[in-house]
């Protein structure tokens, strides 16, 4: 199966290799502009150079191309705790990320958030924080997992999933709270 | 010999639209960049708008993004700028230009006049 | 966008004498993708210099320019009548292209 081409993708496989063929004569193929620049104007015949003009400030083309406009530059989002690692250059976008101490939870394709990573209090480290997940934690005795923080078993109620990791512990508390005195 | 004729100027109210033509000769029209210069009364120049030889890029200065709208109809060697919610700031003469290939504004049309007031 | 400051703003000069034009970018000036342009009264603009230093067709030679980056310069070798006028420098690498405020040659 040929995989379904674009009119532009298309058009430019008329042309070779960095190269894409003039949007008003399709007998002339004019050279992509490299990143960084943008297509200001085509060129006016075969041999010629293409009329390609540097990004403004704000905008940048990551690779080459024949578009008609750079593009925008991106914001990193600030209420997702994002920082900016690198400036937006015109050849390359922003890019963003967490500070120390911080994974991404992606909320979609393009949007994440930045969270603290677990710190595995009354717990141990089972496999460390990364990029893109938090810290998975260990408990130790006593204590049973609820949002990747170790928690009392006191704080374990029977109907919850941590029953079976506490369970002596509850029956424990049951049986105090069963006993009154005569 | 390189020819460009300006026309549509005139009286106009704030508020108002004009639409200005810039009739082309002596070149291969299609192949390049046609720019819009203003002028206003006893100042300097400024960079209005500017349209690729295709047609299919156009730029604009910020002072006239979202009014202005240039286009071309390079059957007809013809250059338009369609000027809608006109303040009394656009006054002005309004020179079409040719820009050389990779280049500046290498001719210069004699401008048409527009004075927006009431 | 890129500033373009011209000084001085009128230059007094007699028919024969050397003019210098400057032209001062707020930041440099891509390729050298500057222009410089005269403008007598009533009339259109006219294309000196490109590239910051390549003539124009039918440019006479006593028109130069020179200069790269942020700083260039126009030097009219010997003034002749005809060459008291208004003189911009202009921009054109990056968007919006931009215009100096203008120098005027004038006679003394």
């Known amino acids: 199966l040929v995989p379904h081409l674009g009119d532009r993708e298309k058009r430019d496989s008329v042309c070779p290799q960095g190269k894409y063929i003039h949007p008003q004569n399709n007998s002339i193929c004019c050279t992509k502009c490299h990143k960084g620049t943008y297509l200001y104007n085509d060129c006016p015949g075969p041999g010629q150079d293409t009329d390609c003009r540097e990004c403004e400030s704000g905008s940048f083309t990551a690779s080459e191309n024949h578009l008609r406009h750079c593009l925008s530059c991106s914001k990193c989002r600030k209420e997702m705790g994002q920082v900016e690692i690198s400036s937006c250059t015109v050849d390359r976008d922003t890019v963003c990320g967490c500070r120390k101490n911080q994974y991404r939870h992606y909320w979609s394709e393009n949007l994440f958030q930045c969270f603290n990573c677990s710190l595995c209090l009354n717990g141990t480290v089972h496999l460390s924080c990364q990029e893109k997940q938090n810290t998975v934690c260990t408990c130790h005795a006593g204590f049973f997992l609820r949002e990747n923080e170790c928690v009392s078993c006191s704080n374990c109620k029977k109907s919850l999933e941590c029953t079976k990791l506490c369970l002596p512990q509850i029956e424990n508390v049951k049986g105090t709270e069963d006993s009154g005195t005569t | 010999e390189v020819q460009l004729l300006e026309s549509g100027g005139g009286l106009v109210q704030p508020g108002g639209s004009l639409r200005l033509s810039c009739a082309a000769s002596?070149?291969?029209?299609?192949?390049?960049?046609m720019s819009w210069v203003r002028q206003a009364p006893g100042k300097g120049l400024e960079w209005v708008s500017s349209i690729s030889g295709s047609g299919l890029g156009s730029y604009y200065a910020d002072s006239v993004k979202g009014r202005f709208t240039i286009s071309r109809d390079n059957s007809k060697n013809t250059l338009y700028l369609q000027m809608n919610s006109l303040r009394a700031e656009d006054t002005a003469v309004y020179y079409c230009?040719?820009?050389?290939?990779?280049?500046?504004?290498?001719?210069w049309g004699q401008g048409t006049l527009v004075t927006v007031s009431s | 966008e890129i500033v373009l400051t011209q000084s001085p703003g009128t230059l007094s000069l007699s028919p024969g004498e050397r003019a210098t034009l400057s032209c001062r970018a707020s930041?440099?000036?891509?390729?050298?993708?500057l222009a410089w342009h005269q403008q007598k009264p009533g009339q259109a603009p006219r294309l000196l210099i490109y590239g910051a230093s390549s003539r124009a067709t039918g440019i006479p030679d006593r028109f130069s320019g020179s200069g790269s980056g942020t700083d260039f310069t126009l030097t009219i070798s010997r003034l002749e009548p005809e060459d008291f006028a208004v003189y911009y420098c202009q921009q054109y690498g990056s968007s919006p292209w931009t215009f100096g405020q203008g120098t005027k040659v004038e006679i003394k």
């Open positions: 230009a040719k820009e050389a290939h990779r280049g500046p504004f290498d001719y």
């Open positions: 930041q440099s000036v891509s390729s050298s993708y």
């Open positions: 002596g070149f291969t029209f299609s192949t390049y960049v």
